[in-house]
């Protein structure tokens, strides 16, 4: 059962940066206060390599980038959504090494992020699926690579 104590805390504390999305019991987070340089360093040192490993054997031109982001907080919002929210044709990327490291980076360098994830965890456990790399998943990870590249170049004008 969803802990309504949390709903109470969030409703009385209107200054908080969380919004409740009852669909899927997922709490979203405003990434404005993250330490972007530390997250960038984590991406460059390890997450990027894990994404490349996942995509190995796929041509870089195989997929068109259809997801974009306008600034670093927006990029992290899109990255989180694409990494952790199940989509049609790609049930879950959450078990992948790049996903675990992404979650770690957000937990470490985005103050308060972990608290938005506690209840999402319960829903995730019920939705566990067999790990299969589908073409749809490859396309999704290709989009993620584009979002991360955009995150690392925040001063570029939006196309």
């Amino acid at each position: 059962m969803f802990p309504f104590a949390l709903l109470y805390v969030l409703s009385v504390s209107f200054r908080k940066i969380f919004i409740l999305q009852l669909v899927g019991l997922v709490l979203t987070y405003d990434f404005t206060n993250c330490d972007f340089e530390k997250i960038k360093a984590a991406y460059l040192s390890t997450i990027s390599k894990d994404l490349i490993t996942y995509m190995s054997g796929t041509k870089s031109t195989e997929f068109n980038n259809t997801v974009s982001c306008s600034n670093r907080p927006h990029c992290l919002t899109e990255i989180q959504s694409l990494t952790f929210n199940p989509t049609a044709g790609c049930a879950s990327l959450a078990k992948e090494m790049f996903a675990m490291k992404t979650k770690a980076a957000l937990a470490i360098w985005c103050p308060g992020y972990s608290e938005t994830q506690i209840n999402a965890t319960q829903a995730m456990k019920k939705r566990r699926k067999r790990k299969v790399t589908t073409n749809k998943c490859l396309e999704q990870v290709s989009q993620l690579q584009g979002l991360w590249r955009r995150f690392n170049r925040p001063l570029l004008k939006q196309q």
Epitope: A5, L6, V9, R15, K16, I17, D35, K38, A41, A42, S45, T46, A94, K95, A99, M100, K101, K103, A104, A105, A107, I108, W109, P111, G112, S114, E115, Q117, I118, A120, T121, M124, K125
Partner: antibody, heavy 124, light 107 residues
Framework: QVQLVQSGAEVKKPGSSVKVSCKAS????????ISWVRQAPGQGLEWMGN????????NYAQKFQGRVTITADESTSTAYMELSSLRSEDTAVYYC?????????????????WGQGTLVTVSS | DIQMTQSPSSLSASVGDRVTITCRAS??????LTWYQQKPGKAPKLLIY???SLQSGVPSRFSGSGSGTDFTLTISSLQPEDFATYYC?????????FGQGTKVEIK
């Protein structure tokens, strides 16, 4: 089930350094952080710093900045805390603790598994 | 660093009493707060995380509340094994800080 086993008691001279180890077993070492906390005799708990083996990143309490170094060796699932320029006020029990967990199913920021503690005595 | 102020520093109570310990943060920490219990010569034990989530295996007589800067640990009916020292700890961002502790003694 994760267990943390720390190295034995140490007696050190003022001005010297001490290095305490914390060996983890029963879990994926890189999927959680390790915190170091100390407790002087009859005093409260004092957070010293964290290490995140997944990124090799450490951060420290302002009070200990420049005097403490926290490292991790993923190959042996061991974290280390080195404190330099020891003084008598550093006499304390030093604990390591598992801090959060960053796997597929997210955990919290609490310290849920603790080592047995290592007594470090600084005396001339 | 964020400062944590706990009150009272000690209290005397009897078995069956309702006990409340408060913790105040020097700045908004959302709900990034934990509570620990420590007995003499032992490592601390995690009771509450995320301000009000009960750690697995901890009796339901323990509860936490609060958000932002003000937090409370409540023991609804004090048991003999609950006489100990209690600490709050914030973990907002990458730093952490403990409160100075509250010793719960037998009246």
């Amino acid at each position: 089930q994760v267990q943390l086993v720390q190295s034995g008691a140490e007696v050190k001279k003022p001005g010297s350094s001490v290095k305490v180890s914390c060996k983890a077993s029963g879990g994926t070492f890189s999927s959680y952080a390790i915190s170091w906390v100390r407790q002087a005799p009859g005093q409260g708990l004092e957070w010293m710093g964290n290490i995140y083996p997944i990124f090799g990143y450490a951060n420290y309490a302002q009070k200990f900045q420049g005097r403490v170094t926290i490292t991790a060796d993923e190959s042996t699932s061991t974290a280390y805390m080195e404190l330099s320029s020891l003084r008598s006020e550093d006499t304390a029990v030093y604990y390591c603790a598992r801090y959060g967990q960053y796997g597929q199913h997210f955990s919290h920021g609490g310290m849920d598994v603790w080592g047995q503690g290592t007594l470090v005595t600084v005396s001339s | 660093d964020i400062q944590m102020t706990q009150s009272p520093s000690s209290l005397s109570a009897s078995v069956g009493d309702r006990v409340t310990i408060t913790c105040r943060a020097s700045q908004d920490i959302s709900i990034s707060l934990t509570w620990y219990q420590q007995k003499p010569g032992k490592a601390p034990k995690l009771l509450i995380y995320g301000a009000f989530s009960l750690q697995s295996g901890v009796p339901s007589r323990f509860s936490g509340s609060g958000s932002g800067t003000d937090f409370t640990l409540t023991i609804s009916s004090l048991q003999p094994e609950d006489f100990a020292t209690y600490y709050c700890q914030q973990y907002y961002g990458t730093s952490a800080t403990f409160g100075q502790g509250t010793k719960v003694e037998i009246k």
